[in-house]
Each structure stands twice: as structure tokens, then as C-alpha cells.
């Protein structure tokens, strides 16, 4: 280790490179400066992402993976640091960058939105479930009429190209559907989506975007909702949605609409049953929706409401939605 009175001059790392290793993914690599003295001290490196989004962190190893959009270019710097309890010594920065890809910004797509959904797998020999992906976008305002767009997603180490597109009136792809993907329902990794394009008339700038799964996962509605009236008690029950998340991971909202006076009651629950006191003169429609609870992942989207069930008035026998 360094003695208190020992002077050390820190030199910047060498051979700093940025390599694109996948869709919206780069690998930063560098080497320790060969002229660095006191090689036995605990040297670290500070990595600074300059663009497209500022970030900085420290590492002891000489490489770093970074998940980032690349359509705006990418710029990073790294320097050697030596820190103890009292001070921080640092070298000058070594920098590298990736330029924005060719094509004017107006040629790339805009308003890319994606949603995931869980469905039963019709192909599987076992009763298993798949994560589907649906994305839509708008054609770039400066894109020539012959522009064609192509969508890819990456999740973890899987990258797939879209095979099922929807088109606009000019035959340009404006939406994509993956019935089955390698996306994990419970995954915590970013979903990376890239839409690039081609035209005979000009370069089309690609567009990539990162999505947090919790923010785009369209939860299925609750299953087997039943409602039954006994006197002035309305009993509602349901089952958890088709989902990778277990039973304790759901919040629910129950909506009870009195069709006679228009009164709307909405209750938020963590259980899969609810009892409401009602008048026995009215007819009611009942709906339930679900969301994954913040106990199990970050807050996300509510499901669609279940199909309405009508009870009350002359319909005192239980009704079931299948």
C-alpha cells in the first residue's frame, strides 16, 4: 500500500474502445496504462457516460457492459482513480465515442409503443404460457414513401426479428406482433427494441428504445368472476389472472354499478372476494380488474376490466363468467 508521504502520479487507461455487442448494448474495454508505477496499489477506474444519458460509476475491472440507446450516438470516458479514506487521486480522462447512425432524424420512426401480454401456448405439449409482444409506431415525417421499417427486440441474450407486421396504406410496416418471445414475465432486465429502415432515396435513421417490463406488461383480467345476491348482500369472487406471478402478488379493483340510479362504487382490494351491502330493488353490473402488487414488482398497468356480470332485480340466481 501507499505510504502517507509517497507521491503517485496516475496515468489514464489506454486502448479505450466502445464495441456494440448487441441491440442497445455496448461493451467498454480498456487496459491499465503500461507506464503506471506502483502497479501493486488498489487502482480503480471511474467510468463516465457522457451521452446519450449522463451516468458514472466505479469498477475494479477493465471492462464494463452498458445497456443504452444508440440512435443518438454514445460517448464515454474512463480514468484511473486511487481513493482512500481522506482523498481521491485521479488521472486525466481517456474518451471514446460512437457517432449517431446515418440518416436525418426525421426519417426514423416516432411514437414507438410496446406492450407485453401473457397467453396460453397453443403449441406446447405441456400447459405452459408465453409472453407476446406488440409494438406500434408512426412513420417518420421525412421518410420517403418507399421507406420500409423492420423491428427487432432483445431480451437478455436473445434477439429476434419481427415476422408479423401490420402496414399502412402505402405498404409501410407500422406495427409488429410476436405471438411468442423469449421475454421473461418476471424479468428485471430492460427490453430493447430497435426499428431500422431502408429506402432507395435516402438513409433511414434507426430508432431504439428501452422498456421496463413492469411499465408495459398488460396484465390479463381476473378469471371466473362470479356475483351472487342474498338479500342485501352482494358477494363477488374471482380468480387471479393468467400470470407468472403467484396469488399473493395481485391488487384488485371491484367496480359495482347500480344501473337504476347510476351510482358507481369502486373498491381496491388485496383479496379475491368482496361483499357489498346493496338495495334489493336495483340491478347491478359488476367488473373486476387486476394489477401486480408493489410487493412483487414496481407499479405497472391495470388490466382491462373483466366482462360485466349483471345481477339483481329479478336475477337472484348466481351468474358466472366463463
Amino acid at each position: 500500500d501507499l505510504l502517507p508521504d509517497e507521491k503517485i502520479s496516475l496515468l489514464p487507461p489506454v486502448n479505450f474502445t466502445i464495441k456494440v455487442t448487441g441491440l442497445a448494448q455496448v461493451l467498454l474495454q480498456w487496459k491499465p496504462n503500461p507506464d503506471q508505477e506502483q502497479r501493486n496499489v488498489n487502482l480503480e477506474y471511474q467510468v463516465k457516460i457522457n451521452a446519450p444519458k449522463e451516468d458514472d460509476y466505479e469498477t475494479r475491472i477493465t471492462e464494463s457492459k452498458c445497456v443504452t440507446i444508440l440512435h443518438k450516438g454514445f460517448s464515454a470516458s474512463v480514468r484511473t482513480i486511487l481513493q482512500n479514506d481522506h482523498s481521491l487521486l485521479a488521472s486525466s480522462w481517456a474518451s471514446a465515442e460512437l457517432h449517431a447512425p446515418p440518416g436525418s432524424p426525421g426519417t426514423s420512426i416516432v411514437n414507438l409503443t410496446c406492450t407485453t401480454n401473457t397467453t396460453e401456448d397453443n403449441y406446447s405439449r405441456l400447459r405452459s404460457y408465453q409472453v407476446s409482444l406488440h409494438c406500434t409506431w408512426l412513420v417518420g415525417t421525412d421518410a420517403p414513401e418507399d421507406t420500409q421499417y423492420f423491428l427487432y427486440y432483445r431480451y437478455g441474450s436473445w434477439t429476434e426479428e419481427c415476422q408479423e407486421y401490420s402496414k399502412d396504406t402505402l405498404g409501410r410496416n407500422i406495427a409488429c406482433w410476436f405471438p411468442r418471445t423469449f421475454i421473461l414475465s418476471k424479468g428485471r432486465d430492460w427490453l430493447a427494441v430497435l426499428v431500422n429502415g431502408s429506402s432507395k432515396h435516402s438513409a433511414i435513421r434507426p430508432f431504439d428504445q428501452l422498456f421496463a417490463l413492469h411499465a408495459i406488461d398488460q396484465i390479463n383480467p381476473p378469471l371466473n368472476v362470479t356475483a351472487e345476491i342474498e338479500g342485501t348482500r352482494l358477494s363477488i369472487q374471482w380468480e387471479k389472472p393468467v400470470s407468472a406471478f403467484p396469488i399473493h402478488c395481485f391488487d384488485y379493483e371491484v367496480k359495482i354499478h347500480n344501473t337504476r340510479n347510476g351510482y358507481l362504487q369502486i373498491e381496491k382490494l388485496m383479496t379475491n372476494a368482496f361483499i357489498s351491502i346493496i338495495d334489493d330493488l336495483s340491478k347491478y353490473d359488476v367488473q373486476v380488474r387486476a394489477a401486480v402488487s408493489s410487493m412483487c414488482r414496481e407499479a405497472g398497468l391495470w388490466s382491462e376490466w373483466s366482462q360485466p356480470i349483471y345481477v339483481g332485480n329479478d336475477e337472484h340466481k348466481p351468474l358466472r363468467e366463463w
Epitope: Q130, V131, L184, S185, G187, D189, A244, C296
Partner: antibody, heavy 121, light 112 residues
């Protein structure tokens, strides 16, 4: 009845190459991602590689990346594993298996009987 | 080190109950990812025994069951029979691994 039948194993010298095949029948091959899993003598299972149903997307274990190439011919219902720059540690029984997923987590529902690859001088 | 840890061997007498543990980490089982179990009778290919933590494919007796808690999973076999003597492997998804597939080292079950 799902059937997976591997072939192409044998004895090869270090640095050599070998191509394994897996003939599939009894299911719609083109609907399924497929995989290779290996097992060294007296050892456990090690996932090697996988390929999506259309054959355009592939994945490899770090131990074989850059040396092995997985591919498929859906018209022939056949999965392949091209193995180059073979090493002694690649000696194993190589199994062909379907790469199914449940909520995205992979599992291997059907397996072939395996083909033995021995890398030795 | 990435991977799932299993005991190398377990043994029990016929008719007894035995459990095989599978210990992981936050990058696999601890993230809630499903665990699958395989049975490999000596000299044969592995066979899927349990998928999605606790579901049995058709043809697998209900003597086999799976469970999961925290960063660990376990396989339980009740009413042990001689034909259950085999190697058992757990498998899951690991977000830290290239390719994401992770197996346990395997457990040799001996029926005494």
C-alpha cells in the same frame, strides 16, 4: 409421439471439427425453439446452445461461443451443431432437446438419446 | 460462482420420503424464476419430471412434487420405489449467465 435422434458423434483430435445432427419427428418442428445440452462422462448436465423456431436467432454458453454453431433446416426437420476447434473438455454425450419456455423460463421437455463425442489425440 | 447447488447424493429405504435441495442466488431462483427438475436413470437420457416449480407432466406419478422458497427449491419423493434410483437435476433461468440456462450439479438418489 415426439422423437429426437442424434447422430454424427465420434472420435476427433483436438482442434478438429465435427457436425452433429438431430432428426425430429412426431411434432411440428418449425414451431419449436431447439437446443443442445451435453454431459461429460460422470458429470452433470451443461446447456450448450439454443436456436429459435425460425432459425434466425441463436444463443451459446460462454464455453463454446465462437467455436460452435447451431443451425436448423425446418424443411428437413433437422437440428445441427457444427463444432470447430474441439478441445478435450468438449468430450461428452450431446443431447438434442426442445427448448420450451413457461412465462419465458426455458425448460427441456423432450430429449434425444444422445450421441457421444470424444476429443482425444 | 453462477450455478445451482445440489447435494451430491441422498439415500433412503423403499417406502420412505426423501427431499433433494437446490440452492441458488438472487440472479436465478431468488428472482422468482421457475425451477424445473429432471430425472436421469443411468444409461438413459434425462426426462422432465417437474416444471414450473411444482407441475408434473402427464405420466409422472404424484409421488413427485416440487416446491420453492426464497433462493432455494426442493424436490420431494414419497413412497420411494426401487425404480426411483437415478440422478436428479434442477434447472432454472439465470440473468447473469450468457444464454441464461443454469443446471444444478445433480444428486444421485440411492434406494437402499
Amino acid at each position: 409421439q415426439v422423437q429426437l435422434q442424434e447422430s454424427g458423434g465420434g472420435l476427433v483430435q483436438p482442434g478438429g471439427s465435427l457436425r452433429l445432427s438431430c432428426a425430429a419427428s412426431g411434432f411440428t418442428f418449425s414451431n419449436y425453439a431447439m437446443s443442445w445440452v451435453r454431459q461429460a462422462p460422470g458429470k452433470g448436465l451443461e446447456w450448450v446452445s439454443a436456436i429459435n423456431s425460425g432459425g434466425k436467432s441463436t444463443n451459446y454458453a460462454d464455453s463454446v461461443k465462437g467455436r460452435f454453431t447451431i443451425s436448423r433446416d425446418n424443411a428437413k426437420n433437422t437440428l445441427y451443431l457444427q463444432m470447430n476447434s474441439l478441445r478435450a473438455e468438449d468430450t461428452a454425450v450431446y443431447y438434442c432437446a426442445d427448448y420450451a419456455t413457461n412465462y419465458g423460463v426455458p425448460y427441456f421437455g423432450s430429449w434425444g438419446q444422445g450421441t457421444m463425442v470424444t476429443v482425444s489425440s | 460462482q453462477a450455478g445451482l447447488t445440489q447435494p451430491p447424493s441422498v439415500s433412503a429405504a423403499p417406502g420412505q420420503r426423501v427431499t433433494i435441495s437446490c440452492s441458488g442466488s438472487r440472479s436465478n431462483i431468488g428472482s422468482g424464476y421457475d425451477v424445473h427438475w429432471y430425472q436421469q436413470v443411468p444409461g438413459t437420457a434425462p426426462k422432465l419430471l417437474i416444471f414450473d416449480d411444482n407441475n408434473r407432466p402427464s405420466g409422472v406419478p404424484d409421488r413427485f412434487s416440487g416446491s420453492k422458497s426464497g433462493t432455494s427449491a426442493s424436490l420431494a419423493i414419497t413412497g420411494l420405489q426401487a425404480e426411483d434410483e437415478a440422478d436428479y437435476y434442477c434447472q432454472s433461468y439465470d440473468s447473469s449467465l450468457s444464454g441464461h440456462v443454469v443446471f444444478g450439479g445433480g444428486t444421485k438418489l440411492t434406494v437402499l
